[in-house]
């Protein structure tokens, strides 16, 4: 309507404050100065907005800023945030972590919304690099950030930010993240003693290779069945009952309820029913004694 | 401890009027907006009214505006309703409601007090 | 803006899965709160932004929904759900009230 688009006598913003509160779409519109909008955003979260007038909010800021945002307004954006799209977002160009924390902290107890993904995507593009300090303030609030990344982007994480990870932000990493992620937990942690050094390293086995387990198995880690079970196939495959069975150490009787299952099922196969004897678990589907055990892969290697 | 408690609810007769109050404590009372939302006998809830944090604003639902009051003495930490005019349709209980600090869903509420319309 | 609830009451045993659905007259975003109230008891806030958990509510407690069609979930019913549930939008005023859900136990 007309008459609605000049703003009332008296109505004038002067300042971002309470006394906004019950305008209509139309007074927001006509009565508050985008530019005074802009310099006082950090005044809008302390003020409860309807929806509808967020949107009227956010419709200023998309006009005056029409190329994105600023980071002096983003930073402030607060709960304005939630009404931002991904291609909002594609337009910004954040580079504090102060500016990323705050606006993490308005989506918290949501779920990683594509606003946040694009941001995070954003802020990480922008840095080069997922650094120490990002990766902390990122698995805070998503703990399961880390998996969520593809394997090549994992290749960006510098082993300085592996200590950064907690156990839980690698639960629905798959085997192939894990392959990226452990050796770069490997090179972080090479400088700590034995014991030390397999809690911390524990939680990226799911990416060691043979010879790795070997070396853990002449150090009594007392690995878990957990743990052992996340191990991959192939490096677990050429174990043998001795190395397996110092590898677990006192855990080694948890075998038995594991034996239908990968990588414990696959491992007994290649294993001599002799040896699975020797563990006294009661273990079969070993090889039978007096049977030749032929390595085609190595014969192949040969010729 | 923080807590909302009313007062002030009775029996009145139509065309009378009643003042309702709302004791807060245990939060910043100034620094939030406040409502009041009723619940006639046995039905669902309604919005009334609601106030800015320093009381410079205010909001009434349509069908009260004209007839009820709302206001707060920030220094006292209360929130009143001055109901006039009052209608059999106005008989409700009447809960005092704190506002989340930057969005309009009500996190903190009263016991309620019960008014009665009737001749 | 209207908000209809449903079913107005439903009766379910312990244990059971619950869902309760609310929709909006226009779309609200994800405006939308959810609330719990017993008998002579004051509504208490459950959900809020549509499917962020209030703090301090089990986590059998769920919200879901954009738009105008909203979900409270109640994923294994205990003794003291057995109550009425409110939803409420605010995404513009006035603000509004569905008109309840009754849990009874069946």
């Known amino acids: 309507e007309v008459e609605k688009t000049a703003c009332p006598s008296g109505k004038k913003a002067r300042e971002i404050d309470e006394s906004l509160i019950f305008y209509k779409k139309w007074e927001l519109e006509a009565c508050v100065d985008a530019a005074l909008l802009a310099t006082q955003m950090d005044r809008v979260n302390a003020i409860p907005f309807t929806y509808e007038q967020l949107d009227v909010l956010k419709h200023k800021l998309d006009e005056l800023y029409p190329q994105g945002y600023p980071e002096s307004v983003i930073q402030h954006l607060g709960y304005l945030f939630l009404k931002m799209s991904p291609e909002d977002i594609r337009k910004w160009n954040v580079t504090s972590l102060e500016t990323l924390k705050a606006l993490l902290e308005v989506n918290k107890g949501h779920e990683m919304s594509p606003q946040v993904a694009t941001l995070i995507d954003r802020f990480v593009k922008g840095r080069g690099q997922l650094d120490k300090d990002t990766l902390d303030t990122l698995t805070a609030f998503y703990p399961g950030y880390l998996c969520s990344l593809s394997p090549e982007e994992l290749s960006s994480v510098p082993p300085s930010s592996i200590w950064a990870v907690r156990p839980q932000d690698l639960d629905t990493c798959d085997p192939r993240q894990l392959d990226v992620l452990y050796p770069k937990a490997r090179l972080a942690f090479q400088n700590m003693n034995g014991s030390e050094y397999f809690v911390k390293i524990q939680s990226f086995l799911g990416g060691a290779p043979t010879e790795d387990l070997k070396a853990l198995s002449q150090q009594n880690v007392s690995m878990d069945l957990a743990t052992f079970m996340k191990l991959r196939t192939d490096a677990v495959l050429p174990l043998t009952v001795a190395e397996v069975q110092k590898l677990l150490g006192p855990h080694v009787e948890g075998l038995k309820a594991e034996e239908r299952h990968r990588p414990v099922r696959d491992w007994i196969l290649r294993q001599r029913q002799d040896d699975l004897d020797t563990l006294g678990l009661g273990l079969q589907g070993g090889i039978p004694n007096g049977y030749l055990v032929l390595d085609l892969s190595m014969q192949e290697a040969l010729s | 401890e923080v807590q909302l408690l009313e007062s002030g609810g009775g029996l009145v007769q139509p065309g009378g009027s009643l003042r309702l109050s709302c004791a807060a404590s245990?939060?910043?009372?100034?620094?939030?907006?406040m409502s009041w939302v009723r619940q006639a006998p046995g039905k669902g809830l309604e919005w009334v009214s609601a106030i800015s944090g320093s009381g410079g604003s205010t909001y009434y639902a349509d069908s009260v505006k004209g007839r009820f009051t709302i206001s707060r003495d920030n220094s006292k930490n209360t929130l009143y309703l001055q109901m006039n005019s009052l209608r059999a349709e106005d008989t409700a209980v009447y809960y005092c409601?704190?506002?989340?600090?930057?969005?309009?869903?009500?996190?903190?509420w009263g016991r309620g007090t019960l008014v009665t319309v009737s001749s | 803006i209207q908000l209809t609830q449903s079913p107005s009451s439903l009766s379910a045993s312990v244990g059971d899965r619950v869902t309760i659905t609310c929709r909006a007259s226009?779309?609200?975003?994800?405006?939308l709160a959810w609330y719990q109230q017993k008998p002579g008891k004051a509504p208490k806030l459950l959900i809020y932004?549509?499917?962020s958990l209030e703090s301090g509510v089990p986590s059998r407690f769920s919200g879901s929904g954009s738009g105008t069609d909203f979900t409270l979930t109640i994923s294994s019913l205990q003794p003291e759900d057995f109550a009425t549930y409110y939803c409420q939008q605010f995404n513009n005023y006035p603000l509004t009230f569905g008109g309840g859900t009754k849990v009874e136990i069946k």
């Open positions: 245990g939060f910043t009372f100034s620094s939030y907006a």
């Open positions: 409601a704190k506002v989340f600090a930057n969005s309009w869903y009500f996190d903190l």
């Open positions: 226009q779309g609200i975003s994800s405006a």
């Open positions: 932004d549509a499917s």
